[in-house]
Interface confidence: low
């Protein structure tokens, strides 16, 4: 018994292809690359039908449907643009992922181009089916600083020129330290900011002396010390990590990391600082920012900053030798011999940064740590040296520039 002639589906074929088919002959229906067999709303790779005894086929010929990769996955801090008209998501359609510039950039300068494959998945030549990663851009403020005047005792910072600065605030709104945003969810600050003053009789740091994550908050995008404005982002604290070799008596390794409960929205007023790429040269000019005390023991209304030079390590050691204070390799000093420009109470943990003129990018050199009084002649400010502890910071945070 002969079965009727078979027509292959559009974008498909039947095998074997014969002039005549008889009882018990079987044919396999398959589709071209990028198409799937569709039978009774079920997608499959192939479909088999058989010529029956009564001269009819066991099933109707299925259709071939173009493969659909469906809506592509969302990219955190990224955007999707469709290269194909009508936002098609079918076989050979192309999409392009990009990052929310200028605050995020794509890791490894990936093209971000993905094509809908015959298997129904979006594929990139380098990353395969994995999505690209949008990393925060560091150290490139939207508002560039005007040339610093060498003003005695600092000057008010221009709004938005220090977008990495963080305020550590008690939950009653009282600021107590500074810090810097690293990556998208970390704050680097001074370890001594995160514990209560120790008993001089028993200067051992115990867990009970540490600030609990629920005892303080981080404010980013802040300009005014106490007044709030629309650019501020208040964030909770997930976890704090003090440097394992931190010594609260000598302030060695006076650096700590604060992990945020949620990532801030990066914008013109909130942006991370870059980690240093190498050691800092003496004599280089750095900028130190904070809301700490000014001369006459007054707190400023807005963020203040000073521009000072890095001081040779041995010069700084000699300056503190009479006070029996050690300036160790994990510390870096800055200031002017005649004094007058210095960090002070309330600035601790805040950033000391420098500009890489070739790249136009700002890098973290140190965090405000300690000193003898504020702005004293022959007494330089001492900062925790970030380059010295960069490996530890990167290990804990996973942050890379």
């Amino acid at each position: 018994n002969e079965c009727p002639e078979l027509q292959p589906p559009v974008h498909g074929k039947i095998e074997p292809s014969q002039a005549k088919y008889f009882f018990k002959d079987q044919v396999l229906v398959s589709c071209d690359t990028g198409y799937k067999v569709l039978k009774d709303n079920v997608e499959m790779d192939t479909f088999q039908i058989e010529c029956l005894k009564d001269g009819t086929w066991s099933n109707k010929i299925p259709t071939c449907k173009i493969v659909d990769c469906r809506a592509p996955g969302e990219l955190e801090h990224g955007l999707i643009t469709f290269s194909t008209r009508n936002n098609l998501t079918t076989y050979k359609s192309e999409i392009k992922y990009s990052c929310q510039e200028p605050y995020y950039k794509m890791l490894n300068n990936n093209t971000g181009i993905y094509t809908c494959s015959a298997q129904g998945v979006w594929m990139n030549k380098v990353l395969g089916r994995s999505l690209p990663t949008c990393l925060p851009v560091c150290g490139l403020p939207k508002f560039s600083r005007k040339l610093m005047a060498r003003i005695f005792n600092g000057r008010p910072a221009q709004k938005g020129t220090t977008p990495w600065i963080a305020m550590l605030s008690h939950l009653n709104g009282q600021p107590f330290c500074g810090g810097s945003l690293l990556g998208s969810s970390w704050i680097v600050t001074a370890a001594h900011c995160l514990h209560q003053s120790l008993d001089p009789e028993d200067p051992t740091l115990r867990d009970s002396d540490l600030l609990s994550p629920s005892d303080f908050k981080i404010i980013l995008g802040k300009h005014w010390r106490l007044r709030s404005d629309e650019n501020e982002q208040h964030l909770g604290v997930k976890h704090t990590t003090l440097h394992p070799q931190y010594d609260p008596n000598t302030f060695e390794n006076d650096v700590a990391l604060v992990e945020l409960l949620e990532s801030p929205v990066l914008n013109a007023f909130v942006m991370p600082i870059c980690l240093p790429e190498g050691p800092q040269q003496e004599g280089a000019m750095v900028i130190v920012s904070g809301w700490g005390k000014q001369f006459l023991q007054r707190f400023p209304e807005t963020l203040m900053e000073i521009e000072i030079p890095i001081v040779d390590h041995s010069t700084c050691q000699k300056a503190y030798a009479p006070l029996k204070k050690k300036v160790t390799r994990d510390m870096i000093c800055a200031g002017e011999k005649e004094g007058g420009k210095d960090a002070c109470a309330g600035d601790a943990g805040g950033p000391m940064v420098t500009l890489n003129r070739e790249r136009g990018q700002w890098y973290l050199v140190g965090t405000v740590s300690w000193g003898d009084d504020c702005g004293k002649k022959d007494r330089y400010g001492v900062y925790s040296y970030i380059h010295h502890n960069k490996d530890w910071i990167q290990r804990v945070t996973g942050v890379r520039n």
Partner: antibody
Framework: QSVEESGGRLVTPGTPLTLTCTVS????????MGWVRQAPGEGLEYIGI?????DIYYATWAKGRFTISKTSTTVDLKITSPTTEDTATYFC????????????????WGLGTLVTVSS | AVVLTQTASPVSAAVGGTVTINCQAS??????LAWYQQKPGQRPKLLIY???NLASGVPSRFSGSGSGTEYTLTISDLECADAATYYC??????????????FGGGTKVEIK
């Protein structure tokens, strides 16, 4: 999302009483929860708060008089030794999300449970 | 401990009018202030936080202002439904919360 207090009743002075706040639609591991009371015809009085991480903070006047604890879906307030001054409606309230600076103003309240202390 | 002193009760105003309720703190509270509305037999409802931020679902007729120790709740275009007692709350967290979280005594608003 809701919070509901239970356990309020008439007790004699000195008899410990535990009030329970049952939450639904959200996780106590993400939110700070507080207790506030209101004596008949009087204003609101803050008792204390338990953080998402389990840290407990009491108003100075409430220390020793109340104990706050929690399980995965309930927050308890124990009145250790009630006096007639503890007669009030006790409210359980959810504070702002812990991820947003953990500020403890309350934006989700229960209807309250009435405790009457009388001999 | 911080003490919050509110405008004495009752405050009376006509429908369509404006009411202002003051809340004075005994010390600087850094705008960590919330306002609540409570109607008889009901639970309190959050209106304002951070001294001036409107809570979700609250009509813009309600507004908060102030800094330092002086704070104000203003209700404009008064409606009958606004008859209630209004409380200010100073809030804090962590070790600061022991004496930080305090309510004012409440101000009753009556609509003429």
């Amino acid at each position: 999302q809701s919070v509901e207090e239970s356990g309020g009743r008439l007790v004699t002075p000195g008899t410990p009483l535990t009030l329970t706040c049952t939450v639904s639609g959200f996780s106590l591991s993400n939110y700070n929860m507080g207790w506030v009371r209101q004596a008949p015809g009087e204003g609101l009085e803050y008792i204390g708060i338990i953080s998402s991480q389990g840290d407990i903070y009491y108003a100075t006047w409430a220390k020793g008089r109340f104990t706050i604890s929690k399980t995965s879906t309930t927050v308890d307030l124990k009145i250790t030794s009630p006096t007639t001054e503890d007669t009030a409606t006790y409210f359980c309230a959810r504070a702002r999300h812990v991820g947003s600076a953990a500020d403890s103003y309350f934006h989700l309240w229960g209807l309250g449970t009435l405790v009457t202390v009388s001999s | 401990a911080v003490v919050l002193t509110q405008t004495a009760s009752p405050v009376s105003a006509a429908v369509g009018g404006t009411v202002t309720i003051n809340c004075q703190a005994s010390e600087e509270i850094y705008r960590n202030l919330a306002w609540y509305q409570q109607k008889p037999g009901q639970r309190p409802k959050l209106l304002i936080y951070g001294a001036s931020n409107l809570a979700s679902g609250v009509p813009s007729r309600f507004s908060g202002s102030g800094s330092g120790t002086e704070y104000t709740l203003t209700i404009s275009d008064l409606e009958c439904a606004d008859a209630a007692t209004y409380y200010c709350q100073r809030y804090a967290w962590g070790k600061n919360s022991a004496d930080g979280n305090t309510f004012g005594g409440g101000t009753k608003v009556e609509i003429k």
